[in-house]
Interface confidence: medium
């Protein structure tokens, strides 16, 4: 089970995406906001240092909208 | 026990591209992050970059423009591509393992490999 | 430069206690992302020591141990004996460079 704070990192990274994200499927990385131009990658953000459920969910693909 | 060797040219002219495998051996590549490191000669370690087995990877932004990271699972292989090396890329290239237990730090690495770039 | 910093060269004779410090910013150590010391004896890879902070991998003795606070965290050797002549380098990741960054290096003289 997934607590709420710790690191994750490899496979169990992606099962947990898997899990969080559900049928949406997950990015590895979120592009450059408009503050920095960098992009984050959640391998960076929950495996060398601890993330929470919250963060997680911010991976998750948006669902196609149905007409 | 996971063991990592890196092999490849250990002369490469100034200009060209420098190639690195390393092989991994007593454990399969999928399910954890591999890096690239390097170590001028007499000077500290440089990370070169790292990356997932399912496509994610990570270069260092110094050398992101000449570095490729390569995997071939069905060989248990990574590779590092360095192109148009000058004198400053003469360094020991190691490859090491980063793994979840660990927290992200670098638990497996191997004996290295000297790289000299001279025409 | 480095960003990560640590002192060129410490020192200690056998038995005493020694400890290295390793000086980041708030866009690394500061951010929260976990701190990784290294130990290479001469001519060999290098060995990981301490993981995320204050780990230490099995096999490696409790003489070492490592911390961390705010922006810095430093490595212990207690015990100091000459096998742990050697350079001993911190890693963490800086999200400013979106990268995995190392300390300069310490060099460390048994007396």
């Known amino acids: 089970a997934y607590r709420p704070s710790e690191t994750l990192c490899g496979g169990e990274l992606v099962d947990t995406l898997q899990f969080v994200c559900g049928d949406r499927g997950f990015y590895f990385s979120r592009p450059a906001s408009r503050v920095s131009r960098r992009s984050r990658g959640i391998v960076e953000e929950c495996c060398f240092r601890s993330c929470d459920l919250a963060l997680l969910e911010t991976y998750c693909a948006t669902p196609a909208k149905s007409e | 026990q996971v063991q990592l060797q890196e092999s490849g040219p250990g002369l490469v002219k100034p200009s060209e591209t420098l190639s690195l495998t390393c092989t991994v051996s007593g454990g399969s590549i999928s399910s954890y992050y591999w890096s690239w490191i390097r170590q001028p000669p007499g000077k500290g370690l440089e990370w070169i970059g790292y990356f997932f087995y399912s496509g994610y990877t990570n270069y260092n932004p110094s050398l992101k423009s000449r570095v490729t990271i390569s995997v071939d699972t069905s060989k248990n292989q990574f590779s590092l591509k360095l192109s148009s090396v000058t004198a400053a890329d003469t360094a020991v290239y190691y490859c090491?393992?980063?793994?979840?237990?660990?927290?992200?730090?670098?638990?497996?690495w191997g004996q290295g490999t000297t790289v000299t770039v001279s025409s | 430069q480095s960003v990560l910093t640590q002192p060129p060269s410490v020192s200690g004779a056998p038995g005493q206690r020694v400890t290295i410090s390793c000086t980041g910013r708030s866009s690394n150590i500061g951010a929260g992302y976990d701190v990784h010391w290294y130990q290479q004896l001469p001519g060999t890879a290098p060995k990981l020591l301490i993981y995320g902070n204050s780990n230490r991998p099995s096999g490696v003795p409790d003489r070492f141990s490592g911390s961390k606070s705010g922006t810095s965290a430093s490595l212990a050797i207690t015990g100091l004996q000459a096998e742990d002549e050697a350079d001993y380098y911190c890693q963490s990741y800086d999200s400013s460079l979106s990268g995995s960054v190392f300390g300069g290096g310490t060099k460390l003289t048994v007396l």
């Open positions: 090491a393992r980063i793994t979840g237990t660990t927290k992200g730090g670098m638990d497996v």
